[in-house]
């Protein structure tokens, strides 16, 4: 049984040309994280191990730092960037917890971050 | 071969400090949640303390009767676990057990032999 | 706190004969966090069975775990000699994570 839950930035805007940090939370579970994961739509971005700490996609190393903590932050930002963000969590013995980021980026200046929300 | 050695314990007054090192070989020692437990003489296990991967924050954890007096901490860069043990009571003494769990495909649990702390005055 | 509660505390058996260890929690533990640990005098603890029912690695198929929500069993189809020793089942599905008693196994 899956206990926890994954408390994500939610829907977030952003700047053209700007950076966003994108962050999941993993609470109400005892379980250790042996993996995080971060992906756009089907295309991996970054994955931080516990036993090999960060690894960035090559393409997406000019563009993609990792952190704060878990999280990852997205840099020069394009419109091509709007979407769909997922952080996967690879968890013992519970197994793997999916969070949702929307990320919006915006011509103008009118960027404004959405409330955080919660995926079971 | 995996080794979890325990050192630090020995007798100590009551209010007394004294902290424990565990030294770890033979695994992956950063991707590894160390535990401390403790079993006093002719008893059972008693879980102590925890601390968690770089990837879980490094987090804490303790038990009930050691929360506030006991620090758990890491150093990653010398594959070793410790146990800061301040105000000491006579009910803490006990051998203390260095335990290292790790899952990378399989789960693996590893326990140290043991360091005896002997609180009494 | 979730309390562990292991029956019986002692149980006197003869090689060959079946032993059926119980662990009743005093709240629910997610099977994933049950494990059972063996221990001989003067030894550290070993990993007995993770995850209610998964031998660790090089314990005889003679043992066997099963269990859900608060109530755990660990059972030894036929004794051997080597087996005697005591059994701790253990949550860390909770914090702060727990032990049992223990159950002390010993030759009739």
């Known amino acids: 049984m899956m206990t926890g839950t994954i408390e994500t930035t939610g829907n977030i805007s952003a700047e053209k040309g700007g950076s966003i940090i994108l962050q999941c939370h993993l609470s109400s579970t005892t379980a250790q994280v042996t993996q995080v994961n971060w992906e756009q739509q089907d295309q991996l971005l970054a994955i931080c191990n516990a036993d090999l700490g960060w690894h960035i996609s090559p393409s997406f190393k000019d563009r993609v730092a990792p952190g704060p903590g878990l999280g990852l932050t997205l840099q020069s930002l394009t419109v091509n960037d709007t979407g769909e963000y997922f952080c996967i969590y690879h968890t013992y013995p519970d197994g793997t917890y999916t969070g949702r980021i929307f990320l919006e980026v915006l011509e103008s200046s009118v960027a404004e971050h959405g409330a955080r929300f919660q995926i079971p | 071969e995996v080794q979890l050695v325990e050192s630090g314990g020995g007798l100590v007054q009551p209010g007394g400090s004294l902290k424990l090192s565990c030294a770890a070989s033979?695994?992956?020692?950063?991707?590894?949640?160390m535990d401390w437990v403790r079993q006093a003489p002719g008893k059972g296990l008693e879980w102590v303390a925890e601390?968690?991967?770089?990837?879980?924050?490094?987090?804490?954890n303790y038990g009930e009767s050691v929360k506030g007096r006991f620090t758990i901490s890491r150093d990653d860069s010398k594959s070793t676990v410790y146990l800061q043990m301040n105000s000491l009571r006579a009910e803490d003494t006990a051998v203390y057990y260095c335990?290292?769990?790790?899952?990378?495909?399989?789960?693996?649990?590893?326990w140290g032999q043991g360091t005896l702390v002997t609180v009494s005055s | 706190e979730i309390v562990l509660t292991q029956s019986p505390a002692t149980l006197s058996l003869s090689p060959g004969e079946r032993a059926t260890l119980s662990c009743s929690a005093s709240?629910?533990?997610?099977?994933?966090?049950l494990y059972w640990y063996q221990q001989k005098p003067g030894q550290a603890p070993k990993l007995w069975i993770y995850?209610?029912?998964t031998l660790a690695s090089g314990v005889p198929a003679r043992f066997s775990g099963s269990g859900s929500g608060t109530d755990y069993t660990l059972t030894i189809s036929s004794l051997e000699p080597e087996d005697f020793a005591v059994y701790y089942c253990?949550?860390?599905?909770?914090?702060?994570?727990?032990f049992g008693q223990g159950t002390k196994l010993e030759i009739k």
């Open positions: 335990r290292g769990a790790l899952y990378d495909g399989f789960y693996f649990d590893y």
């Open positions: 033979g695994f992956t020692f950063s991707g590894a949640w």
């Open positions: 601390i968690r991967t770089k990837v879980n924050n490094h987090a804490t």
């Open positions: 709240s629910s533990v997610s099977s994933g966090y």
């Open positions: 995850g209610t029912s």
């Open positions: 253990h949550q860390w599905s909770s914090f702060p994570y727990t």
